[in-house]
């Protein structure tokens, strides 16, 4: 299930029209496309250009992150007169051109979405041959990937003075709320760290001091679901060691 966000001010699409007396390039992309992790998404992109009936070699490119300089995730090339755009690059084999660049359509399908795919994408077309021109969407389309929570790490670590602390890290979009439960705890939100820079979908919660032996459970929840994982703390009394 893929949702395309409607931007009322631009009437569904970001339309970038650039014209001068001799030329007119425009590119149409939606501001945002939403899809769930594991599913596929389509990034629509259509364009117009000033070179009437252009039939020469062309290259279609999609890049991520930033326009002009971001890394390419997809590239294909069509020979003169050909409607087939031969894929030269498809990052991890998950990107596939749906549109026909000869018909001014660069729409791209992204398979097996992961949270790491949540970023902005920019379509680009290059004409090569007698006509020598190129154009790239400058605003791009934001791919918003949603995901139910998943606990990626849960652990007990030693802390000063023979004490122990527990850490729980989960990912999800929207970022999940984390709660700890365990002996003498009830339910505790326990020092939730905000998502780390560059890891926008990761949330960590810490239990700074584990005072009782037993089972400690971390629960991660967002609007798409919940997940839980447990660790066990058992200290050898009279010794400084612990078993988890």
């Amino acid at each position: 299930f893929v949702r395309t966000k409607i931007d009322t001010t631009e009437n569904l699409l970001n339309t970038e029209v650039h014209s001068s007396p001799a030329q007119r390039w425009s590119m149409q992309v939606p501001p945002e496309v939403s899809a769930e992790a594991g599913d596929a998404a389509v990034l629509p992109c259509t364009f117009t250009h000033p070179h009437r009936h252009y039939d020469g070699p062309l290259t279609a490119i999609w890049r991520a992150g930033e326009p002009y300089a971001g890394p390419q995730v997809f590239r294909c090339a069509a020979a003169r007169g050909s409607e087939l755009c031969q894929t030269a690059l498809s990052l991890h084999g998950r990107f596939r051109l749906l549109g026909n660049p000869r018909r001014n359509d660069l729409s791209l399908r992204v398979e097996r979405l992961a949270l790491a795919d949540d970023r902005r994408y920019f379509c680009r077309v290059e004409f090569a041959g007698d006509v020598h021109d190129r154009y790239e969407s400058r605003h791009g389309v934001r791919l918003h990937v949603t995901a139910a929570p998943r606990i990626v790490n849960i652990s007990v670590l030693p802390s000063p003075a023979h004490a122990f602390r527990a850490l729980c890290t989960a990912e999800g979009e929207p970022p999940p709320a984390l709660a700890w439960s365990g002996p003498a705890l009830g339910n505790s939100l326990a020092a939730v760290r905000s998502p780390r820079e560059g890891h926008g979908h990761l949330v960590t919660a810490e239990l700074p001091a584990l005072t009782h032996d037993g089972r400690y459970t971390c629960t991660a929840a967002n609007s798409l679901g919940r997940s839980e994982a447990s660790v066990y703390l058992f200290r050898f009394h009279g010794a400084s060691g612990a078993s988890t």
Partner: antibody
Amino acid sequence: EVQLVESDGGLVQPGRSLKLSCAASGFTFSDYYLAWVRQAPTKGLEWVASVSYQGITNYYRDSVKGRFTISRDNAKSTLSLQMDSLRSEDTATYYCARQDWEGGFAYWGQGTLVTVSS
Amino acid sequence: DIVMTQTPLSLSVTPGASASISCRSSKSLLHSPGLTYVFWYLQKPGRSPRLLIYRVSNLASGVPDRFRGSGSETDFTLKISRVEAEDVGIYYCGQLLENPFTFGSGTKLEIK
């Protein structure tokens, strides 16, 4: 770190051939156009040729068309310039450069001197 | 072909002073709003050229903000404030709008 390293040029007689190569590292080679730019002794910069991502499309300045051939090997991250029917006016330092379109000739090799003389 | 005309051919500047180099193209280098294919390069003595400024006014990586590019359409300027000894060399403007890609003839900057 982006690096472009040209092979040695040398002295060649008019009408003869020479092949230059350029080894690239530090970036995704096939994601960029590449170019050769030359500079005659005590003169300015002159673009010679460019090659597209997969080597499908090549561009040349008029004075070298039909004599020079630019090519690339993406598997080996190398750029080449085959120069045939060399003329004295081709004497120059030849630089390979990464052509970033909206980013200009963003990175340059150290250059290699080609002297065409009898 | 697009002709890039640079002025002056050379200039001699006192350290700490400002320097200005002009570049005029024979055709507008504006492709579309916000996208003008003009670039500035510096070639220090005995070295390869180095990109200084891309798309009129954007500073390339590692270039100090004493360098500033400006202009539009056909008229472009590179301004160097607080010139230092390490700024000596030949400055070139260039265009990547149309094949053949062309450069200006260069401006030699010397320190007084």
